[in-house]
Interface confidence: low
């Protein structure tokens, strides 16, 4: 029987800069029941606080609700593992909420085949930003990426859409059924998961003339 091994805070994510969650990996348990606590302070403060919510994020997590989240200061946090034989601490982790944002996927992806009379046909898609993100404040710039592939193909074709919430694609194979997905990321942060796939059938008479 031994003191617990050193835990590691391995990930912190925020959906929108208003709340965030951090997760840790336990070290070895030393063969005894082990309790974990996360403590933190905001840089510039001496007051130490304990994690306000160990439940919402699931096992080995700490969730910071709105009242505990400030995107203006850096959080300094560590996890303490304790059993009957002793304690061990994780390394301190510095967290700026600004840089850990991982939004939800974009919403309402719609895809249409457009066949204008006098121009090349194309695939037109549009989507909405995730609901938790408030773009009006100017605190966020969201960037988008689209991927698509014929249903039975192995490889995805990826297109960067910048800040647009609509996009056109010209080069498609007539008669094929395509899967289309979109994802987003803030300018400093992480890509969201891909949105659920939207299917679109490209008509056989989709003429790729010059």
């Amino acid at each position: 029987q031994l003191p617990p091994g050193k835990p590691e805070i391995f990930k912190c994510r925020s959906p929108n800069k208003e709340t965030f969650t951090c997760w840790w990996r336990p070290g070895t348990d030393g063969g005894l029941p082990t309790n974990y606590s996360l403590t933190y302070h905001r840089e510039g403060e001496t007051l130490m606080h304990e994690c306000p919510d160990y439940i919402t994020g699931g096992p080995n997590s700490c969730h910071f609700g709105k009242q505990y989240t400030s995107m203006w200061r850096t959080y300094v946090m560590m996890v303490n593992a304790t059993n009957q034989m002793g304690s061990s601490f994780s390394d301190e982790l510095y967290v700026d909420v600004t840089y850990i944002v991982q939004p939800d996927p974009p919403l309402e992806l719609t895809v249409e085949v457009k066949q204008p009379e006098d121009r090349k046909p194309y695939l037109w898609m549009k989507w909405s930003p995730p609901t938790l993100i408030d773009l009006k404040t100017g605190w966020f710039t969201l960037l988008y990426e689209i991927r698509l592939k014929p249903e039975k193909a192995a490889e995805w074709e990826t297109h960067f859409a910048g800040q647009q919430t609509e996009f056109k694609i010209l080069s498609l194979h007539p008669g094929q059924k395509y899967l289309v997905q979109v994802r987003c990321k803030p300018d400093h942060g992480y890509w969201s998961a891909w949105s659920p796939a939207t299917f679109i059938q490209i008509p056989s008479d989709f003429i790729m003339n010059d």
């Epitope: 840089e43 510039g44 403060e45 001496t46 850096t74 300094v76 840089y99 400093h188």
Partner: antibody, heavy 118, light 112 residues
Amino acid sequence: QVQLVQSGGGLVQPGGSLRLSCAASGFSYSDYWMHWVRQAPGKGLEWVSDISRLSPYTNYADSVKGRFTISRDNAKNTLYLQLNSLRAEDTAMYYCARGLDARRMSYWGQGTLVTVSS
Amino acid sequence: DIQLTQSPSSVSVSVGERVTIDCTGSSSNIGHGYVVHWYQQKPGQAPQLKIYRNNQRPSGVPDRFSGSKSGTDATLTISSLQAEDAAVYYCAAWDDSLNGWLFGQGTKLEIK
């Protein structure tokens, strides 16, 4: 060792503009908030502005809001302060500083003098 | 007007004596739990950090320098003054309502 080398000060007329630079070396620049602090001749220190590590967030003293702009180029390890609509009361020695915040050692540049006079 | 008020504004002390400098804030800065830093500035030089996080000494700072904080007040103490300690000393803390840093007005320490 940590170095902050400043440039860009000088004499400018009221209403004019200047751009101050602060070249950092000897530390991982993008890991630190950076700050500008000024000191009018014979007076105390006055905080001017700070900028977060990846630079989307900036704070300004009320006395310079809307006239001064802090920015940084992490690729060039350089901090900037753009001074517009300068007034006589902006005359001061301007210092750049690394990490005035807690849990950070504080390093200061040598200062660059800005004189606003007609 | 939100400020950090240092006292005294100047003091003259003999080598070997003890000197204390006080820094009084308010509920939006020191009293809010924000830490206090102390800087030393000699004529023609940039400020140097002497105490950070209320009572921590950066490496290389002699142990005659110490700091403390209680409520809305912070204190810098130099236990046995040396000639090279003559300088102006400033306290600094983050202020919530200004969303910015505040410096005290400075205390000029002279050697008798």
